[in-house]
C-alpha cells in the first residue's frame, strides 16, 4: 500500500503519527501554548493521500494560530470593557453593575491559552425572581427574561462556538435552575486538568456520598453501624481502541482507569466495576454480572490484560455499541435482580467513557443515553441514580457536541470534558478523588493532589495551645474528639484557657475550639519511677479531648481511622468478622513499617516503625541516655510493650512541640493512626530560628536520636471505655 | 505568662567561673521548660542550654557541652546556669527563656528575661 507523503510541518509547531506514514494512521498537529493548530489533525488515507477530517476545500498548509476567547454577546443590567469581537490569551474583560444590582461571579475574568475564561459568570441580579437570575455565559445569547417557578430559559451560541452544558433551564421548585450552566466555547478549545480534576471529583464525591454504606443511628445500646446492603454502585468504564489511539495512549488509558479503580475501592462503598473497550464493536473484559467485579484487584487485572491488538480488524469509534453493552448489561442485571426489588432501585450507576473522537459508526449514541435514562427510570426524582462522564482526549477530532449530548448534566456539575492529550488525562485521574469534599465523617481521607495544602493533606491534624503559645499537636478521630497526649497536661485540670486549633477551608489560621472536657489517662505519672533512677517516665502517655463544639467536615478538617474500628475496617475493605488482631497484623506487618507524622509547619515527615527483633535493638539505644536515666538496668523499664520505636538512619525525629501528633500510615489511599507521638531522645527544633528549621543530630551523637510513639494496639482497653459511645470497636 | 529576672552576671577572668540565676514569677513555672540563651555584640541571639519541666533531661549546646550545667529549684522558682572554664568567646549577654512546648523557636517564645552581661576578659 502507498504511504503518505512527508511534506506535512506545521510552522511553529510539531505532529505525531499514530502509525507511520501508512494508511491509516493518523497525523496530529500541536503548537505551543496559545496557539492552536489549524487543521488539528490529518488522517493517511489506503489512496496514499492526506484528508484533513471535516474540511471541504484542498489540503492547506498546516498553521499555528492565536488562541482568542469568545468576547459577550449581551450582559443584562450592567456593562463590560472593552468591548471587542474575541480577546486575546491574556486578555481581561471587566464588568459592573447598574445601579440596584448587585454582581455575582468575577467581575474581572481573563482569557487563558486554552481559549476559555477564568473565573465564574457574571450576572447583575436584583434578587427579584424565585431562582436567582442564571445569567449569560461568554459568547452566548439567552431567551427568557422570566426566573418564576417553571419558568424556562434557552441559550445558543454565536458564530461558530460551541455549546456545552444545557442548552435549556428550567426554575425548579427549590429555587434552583436544572441542567448545568452552558458555556459557549471555541471548538479548538480544551480543559486544563487542573480544573477538569476538582469539577468531576466534586461531582464523583457527591455521588460517593450518596453511596456511603456506613448509614449511622442512633440506638439504646450507643451507635450501631447499618451497612445497608442496598448502597452499591456500578461504575462502567469505556475504553477507545479505535485506529486514532496510538498504543501508548491506550496504556495511558488503562493506566488512568487503573488508577480510578484504585481510588474508587479505597472508599467504602460496594462497588462494582465493568471494564469495556471498544473500536467498531465493543468487548467487555468485566461485567459488573460477575462477582469478580466487586475485587480490586481482580479488576485492575482484567484491565492490565485489555489488548491493544483486541480490535485491529476493526478500527472505526462505535461509541452507540459501547453504550449499548453498559444498557443490556443494566438489563440482565435488572432481570437477575428483580425490576421493583430495592436492590435493583437502590444501584448508582455511573458510566466513564474515555474517547479521543466523535463516534463515525453504529449510529448515534444519544439512542444508547436514552434507552439507559429509560432503564434505570433516571427522573427529577432518581437524577442522582445515573452520571455519564464522557471525556474526550487530544483535541483533534473530538466533537464537543456529542460530548456534551451524553454527559450527564445537573447543577454545579460539569460532566463533559476535553483534555489537551493523554498525559492531562492521567493527571485528572491522578487527583480527581483527592478532594475529599464528603461532608460526613468518613475517616482518613486526605488530599494527595500536588497542589493541596498541607492541612488538606492530613485534615485530622490540630494544634493544641494551653495560652498563646503552642504546646503539642493531636489529631482528630471523630467530628468531636481529639487524640493527644497525657504529658501535654501538667497544669492540673483547668483547661478553661486552652484552645484546639482545627483546620477551617475559610481561614488559613484555622478555627479555634474550646475543650469540653479533657480525658487524661489516669495511668500517666511523668515521675512513677523516679525512685528507680528514671526522672521521667512515659508509660500510658495518652490523652482525649472532647471539643465544646462538633467540627464541620471539610477538605481541612476530617477524622483520621483509628484501628480496631469498623470505620476502619470499612476503609481497609477488609471482610466483617476481622478483629483487633486483623489490623494489626495488616497494618504493623514488617520489621520497618513506613509511617508519618506531622512537623510543626505542617509539613509530612517520615519514619520507620521497628517492629520484632527490630523494635528491641532500636530502644535498646536508651541505656546510653544518662542524664534522663542515671542508673538504667534495664531498658524495658522505660521503654515499655506500649511504645512503638523509631529514629533509625534516615528517619526525622519529632520535636517537642509535635508530642501527641498522630503516627500514622497510608493504605489503600486511606491514613490509619497507629500510634502517637510521645518522647524521644533528640529534639531537632530545640532552639531554632522557626518552625521551618529543623537539625539534623550529628552522626557521632551519643546516644544517637530514638522516638517514642504511644501504640494504639496497647491502648485499647482504654480507648473503648471511653469512646464506645463515639466509634464501633471491632473484637480484640 | 512567666515573668523573668536573670542576675549573676559580671567580668570573669578565663577559666573563671560565673553562675547565674533566673527567677519566675508565676506559680506556673513548674510546668514550663526552661532554657539559656545568649547574644554577643554583633551576634544573632543563639541557644546555650534547656532544662525539662521535670528537671529529669538536660541539653546543650556543642560549644558549651562539659563546662556549662543547667539546673532548677522548682520550690525556689528559680532557673541556673552554673558556667565553668569560661572562654572569651563566652562573652555575651544571656537571656533566660520559658517555654511550655519544649522546642524554643526564636519565633514563638514570648517568654524573655531582660539579660544579664557576662564579660569574660583579662
Known amino acids: 500500500a502507498p504511504s503518505c507523503p512527508q511534506n506535512v510541518n506545521i510552522s511553529g509547531g510539531t505532529f505525531t503519527l499514530s502509525h507511520g506514514w501508512a494508511p491509516g494512521s493518523l497525523l496530529t498537529y500541536s503548537c505551543p501554548q496559545g496557539l492552536y493548530p489549524s487543521p488539528a489533525s490529518r488522517l493517511c488515507k489506503s489512496s496514499g493521500q492526506w484528508q484533513t477530517p471535516g474540511a471541504t476545500r484542498s489540503l492547506s498548509k498546516a498553521v499555528c494560530k492565536p488562541v482568542r476567547c469568545p468576547a459577550p454577546v449581551s450582559f443584562e443590567n450592567g456593562i463590560y470593557t472593552p468591548r471587542l469581537g474575541s480577546y486575546p490569551v491574556g486578555g481581561n474583560v471587566s464588568f459592573e453593575c447598574e445601579d440596584g444590582f448587585i454582581l455575582r461571579g468575577s467581575p474581572v475574568r481573563q482569557c487563558r491559552p486554552n481559549g476559555m475564561w477564568d473565573g465564574e459568570t457574571a450576572v447583575c441580579d436584583n434578587g427579584a425572581g424565585h431562582c436567582p437570575n442564571p445569567g449569560i455565559s461568554l459568547g452566548a445569547v439567552r431567551t427568557g427574561f422570566r426566573f418564576g417557578h417553571g419558568d424556562k430559559v434557552r441559550y445558543r451560541c454565536s458564530s461558530n462556538l460551541v455549546l456545552t452544558g444545557s442548552s435549556e433551564r428550567e426554575c425548579q421548585g427549590n429555587g434552583v435552575w436544572s441542567g448545568t450552566e452552558p458555556i459557549c466555547r471555541q471548538p479548538y478549545s480544551y480543559d486544563f486538568p487542573e480544573d477538569v480534576a476538582p469539577a468531576l471529583g466534586t461531582s464523583f464525591s457527591h455521588m460517593l456520598g450518596a453511596t456511603n454504606p456506613t448509614q449511622k443511628t442512633k440506638e439504646s445500646l450507643g451507635r450501631k453501624i447499618q451497612i445497608q446492603r442496598s448502597g452499591h454502585l456500578n461504575l462502567y468504564l469505556l475504553l477507545d481502541c479505535s485506529q486514532s489511539v496510538s498504543e501508548n495512549d491506550f496504556l495511558i488509558f488503562k493506566e488512568s482507569a487503573s488508577l480510578m479503580v484504585d481510588r474508587i475501592f479505597s472508599f467504602e462503598i460496594n462497588v462494582s466495576v465493568a471494564i469495556i473497550t471498544f473500536a467498531s464493536e465493543p468487548k467487555v473484559l468485566m461485567s459488573v454480572l460477575n462477582d469478580n467485579s466487586r475485587d480490586m484487584t481482580e479488576v485492575i487485572s482484567s484491565l492490565e490484560n485489555a489488548n491493544y491488538k483486541d480490535h485491529e480488524n476493526g478500527t472505526g469509534t462505535n461509541t452507540y455499541a459501547a453504550l449499548n453493552s453498559v444498557y443490556l448489561m443494566m438489563n440482565n442485571q435488572m432481570r437477575l435482580l428483580g425490576m421493583e426489588t430495592m436492590a435493583w432501585q437502590e444501584i448508582r450507576h455511573a458510566i466513564i467513557l474515555l474517547t479521543d473522537g466523535k463516534s463515525n459508526m453504529g449510529g448515534s449514541p444519544k439512542t444508547a443515553v436514552d434507552h439507559i435514562r429509560e432503564i434505570l427510570n433516571i427522573n427529577q426524582k432518581r437524577n442522582d441514580y445515573l452520571d455519564i462522564y464522557a471525556i474526550g482526549v487530544g483535541k483533534l477530532d473530538v466533537d464537543w457536541r456529542e460530548l456534551n449530548e451524553l454527559g450527564s448534566k445537573k447543577d454545579g456539575e460539569r460532566h463533559a470534558f476535553i483534555l489537551q492529550d493523554t498525559k492531562a488525562l492521567h493527571q485528572v485521574f491522578e487527583h480527581m478523588l483527592d478532594v475529599s469534599k464528603l461532608t460526613d465523617t468518613i475517616c482518613g481521607v486526605g488530599n494527595m493532589s500536588a497542589n493541596a495544602s498541607d492541612q488538606e493533606r492530613t485534615p485530622w491534624h490540630v494544634t493544641i495551645k494551653p495560652k498563646s503559645q503552642e504546646t503539642c499537636r493531636g489529631a482528630l478521630i471523630s467530628d468531636q474528639w481529639v487524640l493527644t497526649a497525657a504529658h501535654c497536661f501538667r497544669d492540673g485540670n483547668d483547661h478553661s484557657l486552652w484552645r484546639v486549633n482545627v483546620g477551617d477551608p475559610k481561614s488559613q489560621w484555622g478555627k479555634e475550639f474550646l475543650i469540653e472536657k479533657a480525658v487524661i489517662s489516669p495511668g500517666f505519672d511523668v515521675f512513677a519511677k523516679k525512685n528507680q533512677g528514671i526522672l521521667e517516665f512515659y508509660g500510658d502517655d495518652i490523652a482525649l479531648l472532647k471539643l465544646a463544639q462538633k467540627v464541620k467536615m471539610s477538605t481541612h478538617a476530617r477524622p483520621i481511622c483509628l484501628p480496631c474500628t469498623m470505620e476502619a475496617n470499612l476503609a481497609l475493605r477488609r471482610p466483617q468478622g476481622s478483629t483487633c488482631r486483623d489490623h494489626e497484623n495488616e497494618l504493623l506487618n514488617k520489621q520497618s513499617v513506613p509511617a508519618h507524622f506531622v512537623a510543626l509547619n505542617g509539613s509530612k515527615l517520615n519514619i520507620n516503625l521497628k517492629m520484632g527483633v527490630e523494635w528491641t535493638s532500636c530502644a535498646e539505644v536508651v541505656s546510653q541516655e544518662k542524664t534522663m536515666f542515671p542508673n538504667l538496668t534495664d531498658v524495658r523499664e522505660v521503654v515499655t510493650d506500649q511504645f512503638l520505636c523509631s529514629g533509625t538512619q534516615e528517619d526525622e525525629s519529632p520535636c517537642k512541640g509535635e508530642s501527641g501528633g498522630a503516627v500514622f500510615l497510608e493504605r489503600r489511599f486511606r491514613f490509619f493512626q497507629v500510634g502517637l507521638v510521645s518522647w524521644g531522645l533528640y529534639n531537632p527544633c530545640l532552639g531554632s530560628a522557626d518552625k521551618n528549621s529543623r537539625k539534623r543530630a550529628p552522626r557521632s551523637k551519643v546516644p544517637p536520636p530514638r522516638d517514642f510513639h504511644i501504640n494504639l494496639f496497647r491502648m485499647q482497653p482504654w480507648l473503648r471505655q471511653h469512646l464506645g459511645d463515639v466509634l464501633n470497636f471491632l473484637p480484640l | 505568662q512567666v515573668q523573668l529576672v536573670e542576675s549573676g552576671g559580671g567580668l570573669v577572668q578565663p577559666g573563671g567561673s560565673l553562675r547565674l540565676s533566673c527567677s519566675a514569677s508565676?506559680?506556673?513555672?513548674?510546668?514550663?521548660?526552661m532554657g539559656w540563651f545568649r547574644q554577643a555584640p554583633g551576634k544573632e541571639r543563639e541557644f546555650v542550654a534547656s532544662?525539662?519541666?521535670?528537671?529529669?533531661?538536660?541539653e546543650y549546646a556543642d560549644s558549651v557541652k562539659g563546662r556549662f550545667t543547667i539546673s532548677r529549684d522548682n520550690s525556689k522558682n528559680t532557673l541556673y546556669l552554673q558556667m565553668n572554664s569560661l572562654r572569651a568567646e563566652d562573652t555575651a549577654v544571656y537571656y533566660c527563656?520559658?517555654?511550655?512546648?519544649?522546642?524554643?523557636?526564636?519565633?514563638?517564645?514570648?517568654?524573655w528575661g531582660q539579660g544579664t552581661l557576662v564579660t569574660v576578659s583579662s
Open positions: 527563656a520559658a517555654d511550655y512546648s519544649g522546642d524554643f523557636l526564636l519565633s514563638d517564645l514570648d517568654s
Open positions: 508565676g506559680h506556673t513555672f513548674r510546668s514550663y521548660y
Open positions: 532544662i525539662s519541666w521535670t528537671g529529669g533531661s538536660t
